[in-house]
């Protein structure tokens, strides 16, 4: 091997990557907020809805300070993968009923997928433990009725909104530690 010529900066520094990940998360949070407003407008919710298959909220904002970078990224990626699966299920199961929410739901799915890629790349660059492969998840049961599907949509978008809000706070805090 000869003398090192050096190489140009090939790709963003992980700290810059974290910045763009925060921006993407914020934009996804806004997408989710707008979609929730649309859903409530077209199909008013009668109280809060939940779905047993959704992940529980990772952490309260107050407890963020004690978190470490690996646990935040790992948990966030696992939760977002679950939400991606739920959004895909929602679009498949409720295609005709939620037609009024397309193409926004499709855009949400695409951006969620992009955010997951970004998080994985960040974990690779930092050499943090990678998530194990997803065990084959039992297929989500189709909603029992149109209204059941709409309740599920409220639960999915509401949970995703809370998760993304937590994610923005967590990522901003982590940036100070990197």
């Amino acid at each position: 091997p000869g003398p090192p010529p050096g190489s140009p900066r090939a790709s963003p520094d992980p700290r810059a990557e974290l910045d763009s990940t925060v921006l993407l998360t914020r934009s996804l949070l806004e997408d989710t907020r707008q979609l929730t407003i649309q859903l409530k407008d077209k199909f008013p919710a009668d109280g809060d809805h939940n779905l047993d298959s959704l992940p529980t909220l990772a952490m309260s904002a107050g407890a963020l300070g004690a978190l470490q970078l690996p646990s935040v990224l790992t948990r966030l990626r696992a939760d977002l993968l679950s939400y991606l699966r739920h959004v895909q299920w929602l679009r498949r199961a409720m295609g005709s009923s939620l037609k009024t929410l397309e193409p926004e739901l499709g855009t949400l799915q695409t951006r969620l997928d992009r955010l997951l890629r970004r998080l994985q790349l960040l974990m690779s660059r930092l050499a943090l433990p990678q998530l194990p492969p997803d065990p084959p998840a039992p297929p989500l049961a189709p909603p029992s009725s149109t209204w059941g599907g709409i309740r599920a949509a409220h639960a999915i978008l509401g949970g995703l909104h809370l998760t993304l809000d937590w994610a923005v706070r967590g990522l901003l805090l982590l940036k100070t530690r990197l």
């Epitope: 050096g6 190489s7 900066r9 090939a10 790709s11 520094d13 992980p14 700290r15 690996p70 890629r117 994985q120 790349l121 690779s124 660059r125 930092l126 050499a127 943090l128 433990p129 990678q130 194990p132 492969p133 997803d134 990197l178």
Partner: antibody
């Protein structure tokens, strides 16, 4: 300009030890995971070891587990590979790399022979 | 025997399009882990060519593109040039081995 400069390679007898160093410059080394990847003469790339950006996680290929130790000193922008109980099959050019890896050094040759 | 399988050689004439495949399993490429591609010109260190399946680092021409589907990935080079003659390696994280793995490499010859 990004630079990774390996040193410490050379000729060593089977059972012997060597410590490789890799000095990084031109980028925020402390924000990247550090790798050692080797390439035996005329062969392909083989990943050897990996350490997280802050040194808290270390990963090793089965072929070097228990014999090699990866470490880093972010205050010196340096990555290390301590190689013990060296064998003839460890003969290779050893590259230090950072990120996925995004950046690579030019390599240092380690020859294990009696 | 590499964990990721690549054809040992590939060839093409200048201007042609060439594709190099990389086949893995459910513990690496098939587990939603990103695939990266490296180019190693004769006598030099490897260089990152494609990261995260299809992203190009700055400075890499858009003649190079990557894709991934299921447990396989591929690198496509269009408008082949003599300076593309090199060894190409794919890489991905492997969960069962708890580390990155490389393909055996593909030697590309420009005829």
């Amino acid at each position: 300009e990004v630079q990774l400069l390996e040193s410490g390679g050379g000729l060593v007898q089977p059972g012997g030890s060597l410590r490789l160093s890799c000095a990084a410059s031109g980028f925020t080394f402390s924000s990247y995971g550090g790798h050692w990847v080797r390439q035996a003469p005329g062969k392909g790339l083989e990943w050897v070891a990996l350490i997280s950006y802050d040194g808290s996680y270390k990963y090793y290929a089965d072929s070097v587990k228990g014999r090699f130790t990866i470490s880093r000193d972010n205050s010196k922008n340096t990555l290390y590979l301590q190689m013990n109980s060296l064998r003839a099959e460890d003969t290779a050019v050893y590259y230090c790399a950072a990120g996925v890896p995004d950046y690579w050094g030019q390599g240092t040759l380690v020859t294990v022979s009696s | 025997q590499s964990v990721l399988t690549q054809p040992p050689s590939a060839s093409g004439t200048p201007g042609q399009r060439v594709t190099i495949s990389c086949s893995g399993s459910s513990s690496n490429i098939g587990s939603d882990y990103d695939v990266h591609w490296y180019q190693q010109l004769p006598g030099t260190a490897p260089k990152l060519l494609i990261y995260s399946n299809n992203e190009r680092p700055s400075g890499v021409p858009d003649r190079f593109s990557g894709s991934k589907s299921g447990t396989s990935a591929s690198l496509a080079i269009s408008g082949l040039r003599s300076e593309d003659e090199a060894d190409y390696y794919c890489a991905a994280w492997d969960f069962s081995l708890s580390g990155p793995v490389f393909g055996g490499g593909t030697k590309l010859t420009v005829l």
